[in-house]
């Protein structure tokens, strides 16, 4: 809406608000070691952090949610930090005939917002 | 992935997991009474509830996030309940020249998932 402006500066202090963070995970961590061959270690970008009022609001719904959470915190949850976009990843995995490559478009986050 | 299957039954009990809920809000609640004329009361569908392991996972990223949250709960947050789709709503609002109708495509949630 014209009367609610999302903001990009974190009022909680550095690194506390919704942002992208890299998490190292092995195929064993993911439970994929029986079918994915490579890479054996993945750099997984994930969205972490809090979503204070108006911070990186995804859309009008998120702006409203933030406002109503302030009024009815027990009823309406605060917006939360989720991916706004993804970066594709190619994995090598086992097939009946050997090994093949497959792309995953929704595995690694590229950007985050509060929804 | 072929080895992680999202599920639709809530292990926490009825109404506890991620679902759509209607919240009544007035224009005053939203801080819109100075520029929106109608409707004066909005039925806002919002996504509320928890996202236990594999429940209504939005995509591969959400499945992985749930898995890593189980392994590193302090580092990786659990997936959270956000809109998967929206239903458009028309608002009548003031303009410099009088009154106009405007459609908002991202104001009212229509479906929810865990992202």
């Amino acid at each position: 809406s014209a009367h609610l402006h999302p903001r990009d500066s974190c009022p909680l202090g550095p690194g506390r608000c919704c942002h992208l963070e890299t998490v190292q995970a092995t195929l064993e961590d993911l439970g994929w070691s029986d079918w994915v061959l490579s890479p054996r270690q993945l750099q997984l970008s994930m969205c972490v952090g809090e979503c204070p009022h108006l911070y990186r609001s995804a859309n009008t719904h998120a702006l409203i949610k933030a406002r109503l959470h302030g009024l009815q915190p027990d009823r309406v949850p605060a917006p939360c930090c989720v991916p706004s976009s993804y970066t594709p990843v190619v994995l090598m995995h086992r097939t009946d005939s050997g090994v093949s490559l497959q792309t995953y478009d929704d595995l690694v986050a590229q950007g985050c917002h509060c929804a | 992935s072929a080895h992680l299957h999202p599920r639709d039954s809530c292990p926490l009990g009825p109404g506890r997991c991620c679902h759509l809920e209607t919240v009544q809000a007035t224009l005053e609640d939203l801080g819109w009474s100075d520029w929106v004329l109608s409707p004066r009361q909005l039925q806002l569908s919002m996504c509320v509830g928890e996202c236990p392991h594999l429940y209504r996972s939005a995509n591969t990223h959400a499945l992985i996030k749930a898995r890593l949250h189980g392994l590193q709960p302090d580092r990786v947050p659990a997936p959270c309940c956000v809109p998967s789709s929206y239903t458009p709503v028309v608002l009548m609002h003031r303009t410099d020249s009088g009154v106009s109708l405007q459609t908002y495509d991202d104001l009212v949630a229509q479906g929810c998932h865990c992202a």
Partner: antibody
Framework: EVQLVQSGAEVKKPGESLKISCKGS????????IGWVRQMPGKGLEWMGV????????IYSPSFQGQVTISADKSISTAYLQWSSLKASDTAMYYC????????????WGQGTLVTVSS | QSVLTQPPSVSGAPGQRVTISCSGS????????VNWYQQLPGTAPKLLIY???NRPSGVPDRFSGSKSGTSASLAITGLQAEDEADYYC??????????FGGGTKLTVLG
């Protein structure tokens, strides 16, 4: 500094075998895939295949399957491309290239190895 | 015949803006990112743009990439003599994995 250094130019006769190399340095060799790309004289780039040097898993382009063999020796951070029986049509520049973090592009390239096959 | 289609050549005068197109399909560019490589005469290709519109460090901001639907384009502004090279787009295709365009020769006039 990331570097891929390839072996020198080769002149061979049809039917002969050949193995060219690509040595990686300045990064963890087993953490990134290595691909091979062919460029015939005056032509464009063609992807031949890829190897994961850590597990030695290989995947070939359908056009090159059965024509070449890709291998790696992680103890000396080197990838290889080999032919058991060369043909005149194998005359080309061959490049090795390292894959970027998520495997969708090539971020570093070797200088190329020119292979000439002529009777 | 390349899976990705590029014009064989483009040209421009120093200081001008030129664009190079790369046309694909729903099985490649339509679903995945496009990358661009520059090959100066007698040298190996070099990564110029990755993931549609990202520049590796060291690549001047005169180079930019974009993607729309099943097509992508590379734009070069403030053309310089040293930009004369072959340019290749590259993506992923579900049937043949990594695919390149046929290449475009950029000539800087004058």
């Amino acid at each position: 500094e990331v570097q891929l250094v390839q072996s020198g130019a080769e002149v061979k006769k049809p039917g002969e075998s050949l193995k060219i190399s690509c040595k990686g340095s300045g990064y963890s060799f087993t953490s990134y895939w290595i691909g091979w790309v062919r460029q015939m004289p005056g032509k464009g780039l063609e992807w031949m295949g890829v190897i994961d040097p850590g597990g030695s898993y290989t995947i070939y382009s359908p056009s090159f399957q059965g024509q070449v063999t890709i291998s790696a020796d992680k103890s000396i951070s080197t990838a290889y491309l080999q032919w058991s029986s060369l043909k005149a049509s194998d005359t080309a520049m061959y490049y090795c290239a390292r894959y970027g973090r998520y495997g969708t592009y090539f971020d570093y390239w070797g200088q190329g190895t020119l292979v000439t096959v002529s009777s | 015949q390349s899976v990705l289609t590029q014009p064989p050549s483009v040209s421009g005068a120093p200081g001008q803006r030129v664009t190079i197109s790369c046309s694909g399909s729903s099985s490649n560019i339509g679903v995945l990112y496009v990358n661009w490589y520059q090959q100066l005469p007698g040298t190996a290709p070099k990564l110029l743009i990755y993931s549609n519109d990202n520049r590796p460090s060291g690549v001047p901001d005169r180079f930019s990439g974009s993607k729309s639907g099943t097509s992508a384009s590379l734009a070069i502004t403030g053309l310089q003599a040293e930009d004369e090279a072959d340019y290749y787009c590259q993506s992923w295709d579900s049937s043949s994995n990594y695919v390149f365009g046929g290449g475009t020769k950029l000539t800087v006039l004058g």
